[in-house]
């Protein structure tokens, strides 16, 4: 799913207030809901009819430093007999997410939001058949 | 997929530098890769064997203000005949993502990162059956 553009409103102060100095704003340390948990430790990537593998990208100047990308294993989907059914397609499910980019020059550290496109997993779909008129 | 905890390192200055004043840091305005686009196949939520619907949540003090959540339509998966196969299960694919929370008191505006659990779509899985030896 797509993250809409920021425009020029969200990060600005109300019109009646003095503008933000130097094109930056105050980001409080700490993360709300940091202990929230994903309950997906169940190997669904291997047991799906559209299975996928994970690749981890690592960047120490990004938060989170670790971003996991899924890649569909097959073009078709896996049927009940464990064989690939090429009348169906495994397609990626993608999600735009935000990360924080750290920029530093000596002791001057600043941060900036960055949009990253993450493939979260795969699903099995019926291909669209375009009939000739 | 799960976002690891921040710990106390990412948002801190190097040890040799003076600490960040007031528990906040500088966040530059603007978003890197803002024009990046999601290239997901069309209508996959309806064409999937584990179809889903979308619900939009809106919060003007969050960026992005709009967060889209998927809900699987069925418990089972849809077979080639368009019938629900209850020997297979439609399960949600979840992803932890970051959003920015805006907090303001008068002209004093600050921001904080927040973790949000998003259901991105659904996939069809074979439940694990533990056979008796």
């Amino acid at each position: 799913r797509k993250i809409p553009k920021v425009g020029h409103t969200f990060f600005q102060k109300p019109e009646s207030c003095p503008p933000v100095p130097g094109g930056s704003m105050k980001l409080d340390i700490g993360i709300i809901n940091e202990n929230q948990r994903v309950s997906m430790s169940r190997n669904i990537e291997s047991r799906s009819t559209s299975p996928w593998n994970y690749t981890v990208t690592w960047d120490p100047n990004r938060y989170p430093s670790e971003v996991v990308q899924a890649q569909c294993r097959n073009l078709g989907c896996i049927n009940a007999q464990g064989k690939e059914d090429i009348s169906m397609n495994s397609v990626p499910i993608q999600q735009e997410t935000l990360v924080v980019r750290r920029k530093h020059q000596g002791c001057s550290v600043s941060f900036q939001l960055e949009k990253v496109l993450v493939t979260v997993g795969c699903t099995c779909v019926t291909p669209v058949i375009h009939h000739v008129q | 997929r799960k976002i690891p905890k921040v710990g106390h390192t990412f948002f801190q200055k190097p040890e040799s530098c003076p600490p960040v004043p007031g528990g906040s840091m500088k966040l530059d305005i603007g978003i890197i890769n803002e024009n990046q686009r999601v290239s997901m196949s069309r209508n996959i939520e309806s064409r999937s064997t584990s179809p889903w619907n979308y619900t939009v949540t809106w919060d003007p003090n969050r960026y992005p203000s709009e967060v889209v959540q998927a809900q699987c339509r069925n418990l089972g998966c849809i077979n080639a005949q368009g019938k629900e196969d209850i020997s297979m299960n439609s399960v949600p694919i979840q992803q932890e993502t970051l959003v920015v929370r805006r907090k303001h008191q008068g002209c004093s505006v600050s921001f904080q990162l927040e973790k949000v659990l998003v259901t991105v779509g659904c996939t069809c899985v074979t439940p694990v059956i533990h056979h008796v030896q």
Epitope: - | Q71, C72, L75, D85, N89, C122, V125, V128, V132
Partner: antibody
Framework: QVQLVQSGAEVKKPGASVKVSCKAS????????MHWVKQSHGQRLEWMGG????????SYNQNFKGKATLTVDTSASTAYMELSSLRSEDTAVYYC????????????????WGQGTTVTVSS | EIVLTQSPDFQSVTPKEKVTITCSAS?????MHWYQQKPDQSPKLLIK???KLASGVPSRFSGSGSGTDFTLTINSLEAEDAATYYC?????????FGQGTKLEIK
């Protein structure tokens, strides 16, 4: 231990609606499906449908589509089954029953049952 | 829908006897569950996935079968086993139950 506690008996007039609740405890409500089963007097058990509190997914027996509506309130760990346009043939005991988690057990793998709620439709 | 037909509908047996209840499916199924329902009580899971004993169920109960024919066996019946027994499948939508077999203790 797993417990499913259902709301009390109901007597309704034909054409009315009734909403039966099922409060779950002893497990993580979101992680398991909840099913509803009808048992008319001395009759076989009839599966009505099931709902996944986590994904929102629902599955109905065609015979109960338009008759029963399944919902959940995850904050209260409670499942609901609403019957509309009641008729005398809806007189029965209705059970909620826990299904599987979809990962280690099939969603339709029913193990624990509530005590049942008697719904009587009479003019 | 898959129709499950149990046999017999009713059986009167003496304690210590061996009891066999069969469940025949109108189409092949992968697994069968069995439930016990005592008078004025809710059903209780006895056997899951054809042959697995549910927790707390005495070992005198056992299940077997495949395809369209499944069996629930009670070795050495006890008085507390007086109940109605139901088979159930979740191979095909909708999930269905057998009509029940009522066991009476003589």
């Amino acid at each position: 231990q797993v417990q499913l506690v259902q709301s009390g008996a109901e007597v309704k007039k034909p054409g009315a609606s009734v909403k039966v609740s099922c409060k779950a405890s002893g497990y993580t409500f979101n992680e398991y499906t909840m099913h509803w089963v009808k048992q008319s007097h001395g009759q076989r058990l009839e599966w009505m449908g099931g709902i996944n509190p986590n994904s929102g997914g629902v599955s109905y027996n065609q015979n109960f589509k338009g008759k029963a509506t399944l919902t959940v309130d995850t904050s209260a760990s409670t499942a609901y089954m609403e019957l509309s346009s009641l008729r005398s043939e809806d007189t029965a005991v209705y059970y909620c029953a826990r299904g599987g988690d979809g990962y280690y057990t099939n969603y339709f793998d029913i193990d624990y049952w509530g005590q049942g709620t008697t719904v009587t439709v009479s003019s | 829908e898959i129709v499950l037909t149990q046999s017999p509908d009713f059986q009167s047996v003496t304690p210590k006897e061996k009891v066999t209840i069969t469940c025949s499916a109108s189409s092949s199924v992968n697994y069968m569950h069995w439930y016990q329902q005592k008078p004025d009580q809710s059903p209780k899971l006895l056997i899951k996935d054809t042959s697995k004993l549910a927790s707390g169920v005495p070992s005198r109960f056992s299940g077997s079968g495949s395809g369209t024919d499944f069996t629930l066996t009670i070795n050495s019946l006890e008085a507390e086993d007086a109940a109605t027994y139901y088979c159930q499948q979740w191979n095909s939508h909708p999930l269905t139950f057998g009509q029940g077999t009522k066991l009476e203790i003589k």
